[in-house]
């Protein structure tokens, strides 16, 4: 199982509660109530209050605001007030700031463009078997296999929309059911959400920076894991998505609309078409059992063909199998009759990098994800820059305030539903929520959007990535139409759903509590983040996809251990932190398990030997390359050519603090070693920059 | 321009074989079938059977099965028919004609004819 | 077998008049018929394939038509070349048949 962090003898205080509405900045008690932590996990803390279990608060005392993690910093501005500047200061300045923005919208431009790029180079490498994922006969029998396929899929080609277009023509064609669909959108639905979690990995260099960034990328990962947690057994049970998208398909008599606009691909496929072109049919064909379509090539040779449709010649056994009696003839040796046929000319070549190197689709894929990361990453740190070097002072408050102030008494509670409404219209403009999301998680991470503001953004932008779905569903043609339409309802629905179980009501916001929480593990052991990305991206969706082609029996027999014992886990959490006189003096913490089970400590001195051979190896190739050995090795002091990684490992070292007894059950991912840290110090801005 | 040349004629005694060749030229032979007919004198024509030369599948009539052998060769664009047991009534002029293959147009081009005469 | 049968054996008749032969096949042979021309001493040359369709070099003059059953060729005025015996043939089914042929001569 995955470790997780230190648990102390922490004893809780009843008696008192810090209140405080969730989504809000939670407020700063006393400096004196502050405890230095020692690194005895046995020792007794002082000073423990107890927060009720809708608190966003984590397991430690609230510390004064300066410290709190989770606080945006505060972007000084250096540089001269306007005012003082003179005529050639003045005209300097705004020529600089001209030329930040169009750097901003340049780099930003390659961003968006890399993400497409790095969504062609997955369906390269995985694409295939994605499409053999889908062949399975057992999705139709099994929700939790269709759930881990859509997962994998979705993971695999990097775009939801790619899956869900499979499975629309799937159902069109009556390979699968809509019953049997709605797992696999909801898996769908999660595996869409490692694409802003990758562009968080790339905020690794400094640490305060990362917590919110990783946070902020992971509260949608959360929210969708915990949609489904509930949503599915709910649908395996009463079948409502299907019942209510049915109704809705039949009571409209739908015509064909029109597609749905492509508005950031007019701008940005100019420039993807010429890095490499596909055909996104083949995996469609794989899918459909089609055996041709497992020798094509995904990557599409002729752009301009001419399809015509013409009677070929074809032998029959005899003249009696003949299509149409009058032509059907014999040349004395076979017998013949006329067919009709589409036939498909070659006429022009696509004009992209790899249309003549007939290089396999692994090959050109693997070139094209390392190439998309490297651009993916720089084109981040070079747009955490520039919004560093713009966002200091005066502009920074406006658009902080603007951005994450709610409305004013009592309309406050219609900010976060403002929020879930950008967040929609942002994607349709944009027509992918990986694109939004990925561009919110830079600005979450330099301190511009709180994780509180960028939740209802998220959750927006889930609605949004199906309601394109709709209109495309509307465009799609006579046969499946019902299919697709019923389709992009159901995952409508789902949403909708999901956030009317975890935003409304404050105390719901689990995803928040959550995302925080792994945002501070990450924050402090940063292979914590890769290894939650195999882990719930891949392992878990594989290792079920496993059991499930085993059979039910295995599936069960080895699921039902595994559940129960995260329920006694859970349970036992939850009795620790609310009546922990019920159980015998052993339970009521953690320490009766070995340190390993407990905490991350000895993992991370495991994972610190297995990468310390790569640390001077790696930090002084480049900058990029030292972020991914940060990533990796959490090296403190490897990086002597780049600062990167430096991180004032010793004042954090000093300075935890106290742990608060831990409260609910469902931030089981937080604790004092996880959170016990300074954030970096501010003047270290080598970290976001080249 | 397309050619069919055939052999010389042939004149054969009751019991005995002739193999009668038609050699082509100015197209792809084994994108065509060869066809052999035969004429009796002041008669119509009658078929007797054909070959594809890519894949030497071949056919005949039924009331020549057993007699008659087409065979062809590639490398010199050459097909053969062989006819065996000779009677007097086998007595005609031998005609190759070229079909092309997977294609209803029928016999468009033919040779210029063998005489072979069957006589004691 | 399919049996084509050919009327008139022979005809005679002026230059430029119409001529028009018919064949008639045993069974449908839908429009899988071919015209002949053999001149005397002469191996046969195709005039009009499937029926209707004159083939490259073959004259105007020169016209094909029917289906099923009963089949027509016709020559639109009739020249001197055109002395010779036509055949008709099926090839709807396997073996390839030929009609007895119409001998046209000119008065």
């Known amino acids: 199982m995955a470790p997780w962090p230190e648990l102390g003898d922490a004893q809780p205080n009843p008696d008192k509660y810090l209140e405080g509405a969730a989504g809000q900045q939670p407020t700063a008690p006393d400096k004196s109530k502050e405890t230095n932590k020692t690194d005895n996990t046995e020792a007794p803390v002082t000073k423990i209050e107890l927060l009720p279990s809708y608190s966003t608060a984590t397991l430690i005392d609230e510390p004064t605001e300066v410290d709190d993690p989770w606080n945006l910093p505060t972007l000084q501005d250096s540089g001269i007030k306007w005012s003082e500047r003179d005529t050639k200061g003045k005209i300097l300045c705004f020529f600089q700031g001209i030329g930040r923005l169009i750097l901003l919208l340049g780099f930003l431009y390659f961003f968006v463009c890399s993400l497409d790029i790095l969504s062609s180079a997955f369906q390269l490498v995985g694409g295939k078997m994605a499409g053999q994922f889908f062949s399975n006969s057992s999705i139709m029998s099994n929700p939790l296999l269709g759930l881990v396929i859509g997962v994998l899929v979705t993971v695999l080609v990097q775009s939801s929309s790619t899956s869900t277009s499979i499975v629309v023509s799937m159902v069109s064609s009556s390979l699968l059911t809509v019953r049997a669909a709605i797992p696999i959108i909801m898996g769908a639905n999660i595996g869409t959400s490692i694409t802003n979690t990758i562009v968080a990995l790339m905020q690794v260099g400094d640490r305060s920076e990362f917590r919110r960034a990783f946070a902020g990328a992971t509260v949608h990962d959360f929210f969708n894991w915990l949609s489904v947690l509930v949503l599915l057994p709910v649908e395996v049970a009463t079948h409502y998505l299907e019942i209510i998208t049915q109704l809705i398909v039949e009571s409209f008599h739908f015509k064909n609309g029109e597609d749905a606009p492509d508005l950031l691909k007019v701008i940005t496929k100019p420039f993807t078409k010429l890095i490499v072109q596909l055909d996104k049919k083949v995996i469609s064909q794989i899918a459909m059992n089609d055996e041709k379509a497992k020798n094509k090539s995904l990557v599409k040779i002729w752009c301009k063909t001419f399809t015509n449709k013409t009677q070929i010649n074809v032998t029959v056994p005899s003249t009696a199998n003949c299509t149409s009696p009058s032509l059907c003839w014999t040349d004395g040796i076979q017998n013949w009759t006329m067919k009709n046929v589409t036939y498909k000319e070659n006429i022009a070549k696509c004009q992209h990098i790899f249309v003549n190197f007939h290089l396999p689709d692994l090959a050109v894929g693997t070139i094209l994800l390392i190439l998309s990361l490297l651009v993916l990453c720089g084109c981040l740190i070079m747009i955490v820059k520039i919004l560093g070097s713009v966002l200091k002072g005066q502009v920074a408050t406006v658009i902080k305030k603007t951005i994450n102030t709610d409305f004013p008494f009592p309309f406050a509670w219609l900010t976060g539903y403002l929020a879930i409404l950008v967040g929609a219209g942002m994607t349709f403009i944009v027509q992918s929520s990986s694109v939004f999301t990925s561009a919110l998680t830079p600005l979450i991470g330099i301190g511009v959007i709180t994780i509180e503001r960028a939740y209802p953004l998220t959750l927006g932008s889930n609605i949004g990535t199906t309601t394109t779905a709709i209109l495309a569903a509307l465009a799609s043609p006579g046969n499946a139409l019902r299919s697709s339409l019923q389709i992009a309802l159901c995952h409508f629905f789902f949403n909708i759903s999901g956030i009317l179980l975890w935003y409304p009501i404050p105390f719901t916001r689990l995803p928040i509590r959550m995302a925080k929480g792994l945002g501070n593990i990450s924050a402090k052991y940063r292979w914590f983040a890769v290894f939650y990305l195999i882990i719930f991206f891949f392992l878990i969706p594989l290792t079920v996809f496993g059991l499930s082609l085993a059979g039910w029996r295995v599936l069960v027999g080895v699921g039902v251990p595994v559940v129960f014992i995260i329920i006694l886990v859970l349970c036992l959490r939850l009795l620790q932190s609310r009546c922990p006189r019920v159980l015998p003096k052993k339970l009521q913490n953690w320490n009766f398990l070995p340190l390993w089970m407990r905490s991350l400590k000895p993992w991370d001195a495991v994972v610190s030997k297995f990468t310390g051979c790569f640390q001077m190896r790696c930090c002084c190739c480049c900058r990029v390359c030292c972020r991914a050995c940060c990533l990796l090795c959490d090296c403190p002091k490897c990086c002597r050519c780049s600062k990167c990684c430096e991180d004032l490992e010793e004042a954090q070292e000093g300075q935890d603090v106290p742990v608060k007894a831990p409260e609910t059950f469902d931030n089981i991912t937080i604790s004092r070693e996880a959170q016990g840290e300074v954030p970096a110090s501010d003047s270290k801005t080598e970290c976001t920059a080249l | 321009q397309v050619q069919l040349v055939q052999s010389g004629a042939e004149v054969k005694k009751p019991g005995s074989s002739v193999k009668v060749s038609c050699k082509a030229s100015g197209f792809f032979f084994t994108e065509y079938i060869i066809h052999w007919v035969r004429q009796a004198p002041g008669q119509g024509l009658e078929w007797m059977g054909g070959i594809i030369p890519n894949n030497d599948v071949t056919n005949y009539k039924q009331n020549f099965r057993g007699r008659v052998t087409i065979t062809a060769d590639e490398s010199t664009s050459t097909a053969y028919m062989e006819l065996s047991s000779l009677r007097s009534e086998d007595t005609a002029v031998y005609y190759c004609?070229?079909?092309?293959?997977?294609?209803?147009?029928?016999?468009?081009?033919w040779g210029q004819g063998t005489t072979v005469t069957v006589s004691s | 077998d399919i049996q084509m049968t050919q009327s008139p054996s022979s005809l005679s008749t002026s230059v430029g008049d119409r001529v028009t032969i018919t064949c008639t096949a045993s069974?449908?042979?839908?429009?899988?018929v071919a015209w002949y021309q053999q001149k005397p001493g002469k191996s046969p040359k195709l005039l009009i394939y499937w029926a209707s369709t004159r083939h490259t070099g073959v004259p105007e003059r020169f016209s094909g038509s029917g289906s099923g059953t009963d089949f027509t060729l016709t020559i639109s005025s009739l020249q001197p070349e055109d002395v010779a015996t036509y055949f008709c043939q099926q090839y709807r089914t396997s073996p390839l048949t030929f009609g007895g042929g119409t001998k046209v001569e000119i008065k």
């Open positions: 004609a070229r079909w092309r293959n997977a294609y209803y147009s029928a016999m468009d081009s």
């Open positions: 069974q449908d042979v839908g429009t899988a």
